[in-house]
Interface confidence: medium
């Protein structure tokens, strides 16, 4: 048997708690909040849980809340891309899925969410404080990444809220420009929220999912929970990492493009340039655009295998390969 704890999600107060009128007056703020969070800045949510039956078994679920089409999803562990993370799986919507030990099963749950089952023993076994990261490359938003982990004290069978580990990028004018259109709405939202500050605040409560709901949806936090704002990322150092991560190539199985530590000298020097900021509290969700090149034309290393499934006139290249989807 497996117990599951849902990610805490901000929910509007129920009519019975506040009255029908109070609920109606908060509709606009919540709509605006959702717009402010999702329209201009796509989000990535990550959820990690440990199986009750196997202490070394993890399930990672990730989803992308954005309007663009997903071109690639990379799941890594040991830290975010560019901070020593190692690729566990790469999923391409058309070209297939590649996974590497100790990943056991990677699959698409919906068009915008994936799941990955990890199990291992010994050096390649994950443990409770391992950080798992998901990076979604989408068009036109770019690449967005978020990380999550189980705290060391987590009971088996419980899922943990995402542990944010964003990597903010410079040169976001295009994306931020879209977000700017919503600036007035967001300001108005804050104004409305301030006006309603005398009312009971929305409660943090588990997301409720009907048994008939799609599995992926059950794992996706409500969009309102995306209110945690983007913050620059301070490198996470997990005490539990696969032994093979000490090398430049994580070969529990065939793999490609294992990420290596970023050279500080090549971190982008922009408004979002790698500032060290405390990681937000549990229950927050973050994602970061890091798919655009920095102004200097440099990009920190990121995890994610190479892929190729394009038809090739030179011969019958296979769909998948040990160094990446082919």
């Amino acid at each position: 048997m497996r117990t599951e704890a849902q990610v805490p999600a901000l929910q509007p107060p129920e009519p019975g708690l506040e009255g029908a009128m109070g609920h109606r007056t908060l509709v606009l703020p919540w709509v605006l909040l959702t717009l402010c969070v999702t329209a201009g800045t796509p989000e990535v949510w990550v959820q990690v849980r440990m199986e009750a039956t196997e202490l070394s078994s993890f399930t990672i679920r990730c989803g992308f809340l954005g309007s663009g089409s997903i071109s690639l999803v990379t799941v890594s562990w040991g830290g975010p891309n560019g901070a020593g993370g190692t690729t566990l799986a790469v999923l391409h919507p058309e070209r297939g899925i590649r996974q590497w030990a100790p990943a056991r099963q990677a699959r698409w749950e919906t068009q915008s969410s994936i799941s990955l089952i990890l199990e291992g023993s010994g050096a390649s076994s994950p443990c409770a404080n391992t950080t798992f990261c998901c990076k979604f490359a989408s068009f036109p938003e770019g690449s967005w990444e978020a990380c999550g982990s189980l705290p060391p004290s987590s009971d088996p069978g419980l899922s943990a809220p995402p542990t944010p580990a964003p990597i903010l990028r410079a040169d976001l004018a295009g994306i931020l420009g879209v977000s700017g259109v919503l600036l007035f709405g967001c300001v108005y939202l804050l104004h409305l929220l301030r006006r309603h500050k005398h009312r009971p605040a929305p409660r943090l409560q588990p997301s409720r999912t009907s048994p008939q709901a799609p599995r992926a949806r059950a794992w996706a936090p409500s969009q309102a929970s995306q209110a945690a704002l983007h913050v620059p990322y301070a490198t996470i150092n997990t005490s539990c990492r696969p032994a093979t991560l000490d090398t430049a190539h994580p070969h529990g199985g065939p793999s490609w493009w294992a990420s290596l530590p970023t050279h500080a000298a090549h971190r982008p020097q922009g408004p979002a340039a790698w500032a060290s900021t405390p990681i937000p509290a549990r229950g927050s969700f973050v994602s970061v655009e890091n798919g655009l090149y920095a102004q200097a034309g440099e990009r920190p290393p990121h995890t994610g295998p190479g892929l190729t499934l394009f038809p090739d006139p030179r011969g019958p290249r296979a769909m998948e390969g040990p160094l990446g989807v082919r």
Epitope: N81, H249, W256, P305, L307, T308, A318, G321, P322, G324
Partner: antibody, heavy 120, light 113 residues
Amino acid sequence: QVQLVQSGAEVRRPGSSVRVSCKPSGGTFGTYAFTWVRQAPGQGLEWMGGITPISATINRAQNLQDRLTITADESTTTVHMDLTSLRSEDTAVYYCARGFEYSDGLLDDWGQGTLVTVSS
Amino acid sequence: DIVMTQTPLSLPVIPGEPASISCRSSQSLFYSDDGNTYLDWYLQKPGQSPQLLIYRLSHRASGVPDRFSGSGSGTDFTLKISRVEAEDVGVYYCMQHMEFPLTFGGGTKVEIK
């Protein structure tokens, strides 16, 4: 066939740095993997590392990871290889190779090579 | 790391005659998930950059004459030239891309007798 044009020969002192650039003459820049391979005089081929610009992914040989930086400049569709703390044993011809569409191990197209001489 | 060992180191050939180069890997390059063997062959002609000849064990790259063929399985591989021509001289390298780091064989120098 797409040509990979590399920057010219370099002479460097030990302890200094060098940058070698690689620019494809045509084709799509972002969807290919670019790999750097070097060849010391009279020796065989040694894989150094590579980058896949579309996913911003990089890998490097373990013995070079502290000195090697590989970057891609989308605006100029140029891949750069920076090697720091040069030693005499870094004297070699440095090749840029490109793999077919997201490929990683297939070195389909090669640059003409750049000779880097490290000498005091 | 996967170690690639090529033999012979040098191969004198007679134009029109067949030639064969062997390559051995320290571990299997066969990937059961897709049935492919991740071994490539490259030729570096004198004074030139390497060029891809054979990829994934047996597939000829674009423009490569059909006198070149690759075969083998697991850890033992062979590049064959059915009829050597003068333009085939150079150093032949096998390379594995089963896993990182990518590794090359030491090379086999083919020269006309």
